[in-house]
């Protein structure tokens, strides 16, 4: 039975040409994180796999950056970069859970952080 | 040419270890991941594991975790794999393939011949 | 893990006619899929990679298609040495990079 919840950043925001951080943090279960996928909408960025470690897609490897921790750092922000991001832990036994980030991309200097939420 | 060339056939008995070679050639080594899958008489394909070639970091399949070591000499080019305690049931054709880069992943370009392992009493 | 699928598992089909092989993913891989063909008493050989682009020295009667779960290969038009076992496969989540039970092309 998959006991975990996926805690995320929430909504974000951030300006154009600047960069943010995309965290997401599993808790209450025991299960073994095997990988995490980073994807934005059905595209992969990044991975970081428990036994090899961080893995840059080469499409974004010059504007992504691995952590903190199992987060993943977006630079050189662009409108472009608003939509949906999804963090996607692999565990074991449990199997997978998912969280889901928003990121909008300003134009103004005016960027507010969402408040944290938690994804059951 | 690209090319993996393994060891030869091998019989064993239960319970005991056989170590599998496969040498590569026609590419830089270490920059390519390296995986072992194999394929039990006239069943699928099955994968054990994977090595990173540059720095020696594995990441094995849950059912062979305990049994299975996979090794690296970058002198000669060439990666290991070793299963132990081994049983009827692991008569198979053991082959490497080079996967991706190191860097990314990818799927399994280039194979070696296979190396056939009998595990009989 | 995710579990890959393939149907059917046996395809009966003439030469010259087209042959189209499916696989289904668990959950999404993407488009990180590939194909592979075997034949008997030989290693399997790369066809497909990114669900859609042809290995080196692949022809191009050979084409895949598909993004997430659901994902096709289909060989326009039959030739004799293409009648083997083919094999779909995800590499995005490991351990284990898992295989599909395979498809055997057989002559009708």
């Known amino acids: 039975m998959m006991t975990g919840t996926i805690e995320t950043t929430g909504n974000i925001s951030a300006e154009k040409g600047g960069s943010i951080i995309l965290q997401c943090h599993l808790s209450s279960t025991t299960a073994q994180v095997t990988q995490v996928n980073w994807e934005q909408q059905d595209q992969l960025l990044a991975i970081c796999n428990a036994d090899l470690g961080w893995h840059i897609s080469p499409s974004f490897k010059d504007r992504v950056a691995p952590g903190p921790g199992l987060g993943l750092t977006l630079q050189s922000l662009t409108v472009n970069d608003t939509g949906e991001y999804f963090c996607i832990y692999h565990t074991y036994p449990d199997g997978t859970y998912t969280g889901r980030i928003f990121l909008e991309v300003l134009e103004s200097s005016v960027a507010e952080h969402g408040a944290r939420f938690q994804i059951p | 040419q690209v090319q993996l060339v393994q060891s030869g056939a091998e019989v064993k008995k239960p319970g005991a270890s056989v170590k599998v070679s496969c040498k590569a050639s026609?590419?830089?080594?270490?920059?390519?991941?390296m995986h072992w899958v194999r394929q039990a008489p006239g069943q699928g394909l099955e994968w054990m594991g994977i090595?990173?070639?540059?720095?020696?970091?594995?990441s094995y399949a849950r059912k062979f975790q305990g049994r299975v070591t996979m090794t690296r000499d970058t002198s000669t080019s060439t990666v290991y794999m070793e299963l132990s305690s081994l049983r009827s049931e692991d008569t198979a054709v053991y082959y490497c393939?080079?996967?991706?880069?190191?860097?990314?992943?990818?799927?399994?370009?280039?194979w070696g011949q296979g190396t056939m392992v009998t595990v009989s009493s | 893990e995710i579990v890959m699928t393939q149907s059917p598992a046996t395809l009966s089909v003439s030469p010259g006619e087209r042959a189209t092989l499916s696989c289904r993913a668990s959950?999404?891989?993407?488009?990180?899929l590939a194909w592979y063909q075997q034949k008997p008493g030989q290693a399997p050989r790369l066809l497909i990679y990114?669900?859609?682009t042809r290995a080196t020295g692949i022809p191009a009667r050979f084409s895949g298609s598909g993004s997430g779960t659901e994902f096709t290969l289909t060989i326009s038009s039959l030739q004799s040495e293409d009648f083997a076992v083919y094999y779909c496969?995800?590499?995005?989540?490991?351990?284990?990079?898992?295989f599909g039970g395979g498809t055997k092309v057989e002559i009708k």
């Open positions: 496969q995800q590499y995005v989540v490991w351990p284990p990079l898992t």
């Open positions: 959950q999404s891989v993407s488009s990180n």
């Open positions: 393939a080079r996967g991706g880069r190191t860097t990314w992943i990818g799927a399994l370009d280039i």
């Open positions: 026609g590419y830089t080594f270490r920059e390519y991941y």
């Open positions: 990114g669900a859609s």
């Open positions: 090595i990173n070639p540059s720095i020696g970091l594995t």
